[in-house]
Interface confidence: low
């Protein structure tokens, strides 16, 4: 057949859906690849065609839109499953074409099973709540477009396996779940189950997200350099290994990029000729405050190296700080020699 602009398999959009639940999947062409929307394409005489490759198969085949209960259907640029089955897993392709134009993209769809406590291989979105910050809400995600606004679904919220009712500081409010004052004990997986009727049938949408209680911006401070500091002097002899840790504490800040780096004589280590290695480790507190440690290492230090300026720098959205390490060459200890006079002896 004639050439088609093939965008390949769009693995960035790995779609996961639960078994036996409705799923609506928009053709990614209009969202990420083409500069026009479905309506424009449709009015220009372009047709959207769907097909798929089953899991562990190479054969592309048309999607069966003739299943009982209209289980799989297409509406504009959306592929509908009402509901999904486990063996719907595979790579789906949407192709937009007419006699002169063709463009297509494939994407993976994985239908996953969940247990009675909503555990599954599903990758969960994480919602961060500030600790002791006042009322904050999470909203049941990705339920738009499944039912008209005239339909009033029932929504049940769970924390882990337990239905949320009479929880101290967590209140279900329809599609929202409100946290009065979030505490570390509120960390966990929260699930909303949305139940709605459609043409005499009842459907369920299950959406789970992870809540992580993090440091409040009220308590955020600029980076704090714990090491190097004024109390520690790195005294080395030429030929010894020089190890200087730079340890920095960062308050949690939403979407802040935390950076730590060393300069040697005002230059980045990569820009100078000495043999330096830098190893970084990162640890987090329960509220996601971060401690970064970068250890600067020179295996065999020279007397020139011991005269250089070693400065640790740190930056976050709250500010930038720097601290120089105190490095010096060890002064050799004086040699005490004892000369014994001759001629003393017993006669």
């Amino acid at each position: 057949s004639e050439r088609c602009d093939d965008w390949g398999l769009d693995t960035m959009r790995q779609i996961q859906v639960f078994e036996d639940e409705p799923a609506r999947i928009k053709c990614p062409l209009f969202e990420h690849f083409l500069k026009f929307n479905y309506s424009t394409a449709h009015s220009a005489g372009l047709t959207l065609i769907w097909y798929w490759t089953r899991q562990d198969r190479d054969l592309e085949e048309p999607i069966n839109f003739r299943l009982p209960e209209n289980r799989i259907s297409k509406e504009k640029d959306v592929l509908w499953f009402r509901p999904t089955l486990l063996n719907d897993t595979g790579n789906y392709t949407c192709m937009l074409r007419n006699t002169t134009y063709c463009s297509k993209v494939a994407f993976p769809l994985e239908v996953v099973q969940k247990d009675s406590c909503f555990n599954s291989p599903m990758k969960l979105p994480v919602h961060k709540l500030y600790i002791e910050y006042g009322i904050q809400r999470i909203t049941c995600p990705n339920v738009d477009g499944y039912f008209p606004s005239s339909v009033k679904p029932t929504i049940t919220w769970y924390m882990g396996c337990y239905k949320i009712q009479n929880f101290n500081n967590v209140i279900p409010e329809g599609m929202n779940l409100s946290f009065l004052i979030a505490l570390i004990s509120n960390n966990g997986n929260y699930t909303c189950v949305v139940t709605y009727p459609e043409n005499g049938r009842t459907f369920h949408l299950t959406r789970t997200l992870t809540v992580k209680v993090v440091g409040s911006p009220k308590n955020a401070v600029p980076p704090v350099i714990h090491s190097p500091n004024d109390h520690v002097v790195y005294e080395k002899e030429p030929g010894e290994e020089l190890l200087i840790p730079c340890t920095v504490y960062f308050s949690f800040l939403m979407d802040s990029r935390n950076e730590v780096w060393w300069t040697i004589d005002g230059k980045k280590p990569d820009d100078i000729t000495i043999d330096v290695t830098i190893n970084e480790s990162i640890s987090h507190s329960r509220t996601e405050d971060e401690t970064r440690t970068q250890i600067l290492s020179i295996k065999k230090v020279t007397s020139e190296d011991l005269k250089r300026s070693y400065v640790c720098h740190a930056r976050s959205a709250k500010g930038e700080v720097a601290k120089a390490a105190k490095v010096k060459q060890k002064v050799p200890a004086p040699r005490y020699t004892v000369e014994l006079a001759c001629g003393f002896g017993a006669t």
Epitope: R66, P68, E69, N70, R82, N199, R201
Partner: antibody, heavy 113, light 110 residues
């Protein structure tokens, strides 16, 4: 609910149309099956009409049986040239979640000379 | 064409006892689980008991259970009651979009 009508006593060779009337069911997104049961015998699937008016029939029923949607609330089963073998109670049933979950009471068709 | 076989045409049960009815399909049902069970009493339409092999239909007592996958399925009635006297049918739905019914098993409660 679903309700069948149109069953009666007919002579062999006569055509007959049975009607399934639904209420509270949207035929644009719900399928309707026809099933029959000869006196004292088991259930026999005839066919199905789904969303988009797509019809499926059992291989034995093709040709002589036609299923069609006649309004937003009715589905017809047309049988041409009835034989005594077609004597049965004819049920219509909605496709539920992978099964026929809502049945009518049935309508009796008797073919006799 | 698919053939659904219910080996026993009739089984006898005592009140409080357990009955199992088997259903074998000549080929795998759709998604390996599109097998349903129906109860029919004389003069009445069939009533859905179990769908997708093991899911209990709304309002059906817990003493009914279904199991199986692919081609072999079982309906179990635990703690049989006199009201369970009826004929039970299995039905399979297939990739070909056909529906097949088993021949039925009559449960006689003594």
């Amino acid at each position: 609910s679903v309700e069948e009508s149109g069953g009666r006593l007919v002579t062999p060779g006569t055509p007959l149309t049975l009607t399934c009337t639904v209420s509270g069911i949207d035929l644009n997104s719900n399928g309707i099956n026809w099933v029959r049961q000869a006196p004292g015998k088991g259930l026999e699937w005839i066919g199905y009409i789904g969303a988009g008016d797509i019809t499926y029939c059992a291989s034995w029923a093709k040709g002589r049986f036609t299923i069609s949607k006649t309004s937003s609330t009715t589905v017809d089963l047309k049988i041409t040239s009835l034989t005594t073998e077609d004597t049965a109670t004819y049920f219509c049933a909605r496709w539920g979640p992978g099964a026929l979950d809502l049945w009518g009471q049935g309508t009796l068709v008797t073919v006799s000379s | 064409a698919q053939v659904l076989t219910q080996t026993a045409s009739s089984v006898s049960a005592t009140v409080g006892g357990t009955v199992t009815i088997s259903c074998q399909s000549s080929q795998s049902v759709y998604n390996n689980n599109y097998l349903s069970w129906y109860q029919q009493k004389p003069g009445q339409p069939p009533k859905l008991l179990i769908y997708k092999a093991s899911t209990l239909a709304s309002g059906v007592p817990l003493r009914f259970s279904g199991s199986g996958s692919g081609t072999q399925f079982t309906l179990t009635i635990s703690g049989v009651q006199s009201d369970d006297a009826a004929t039970y049918y299995c039905a399979g739905f297939y990739e070909t979009t056909d529906v097949g019914f088993g021949g039925g098993t009559e449960v006689v409660v003594k």
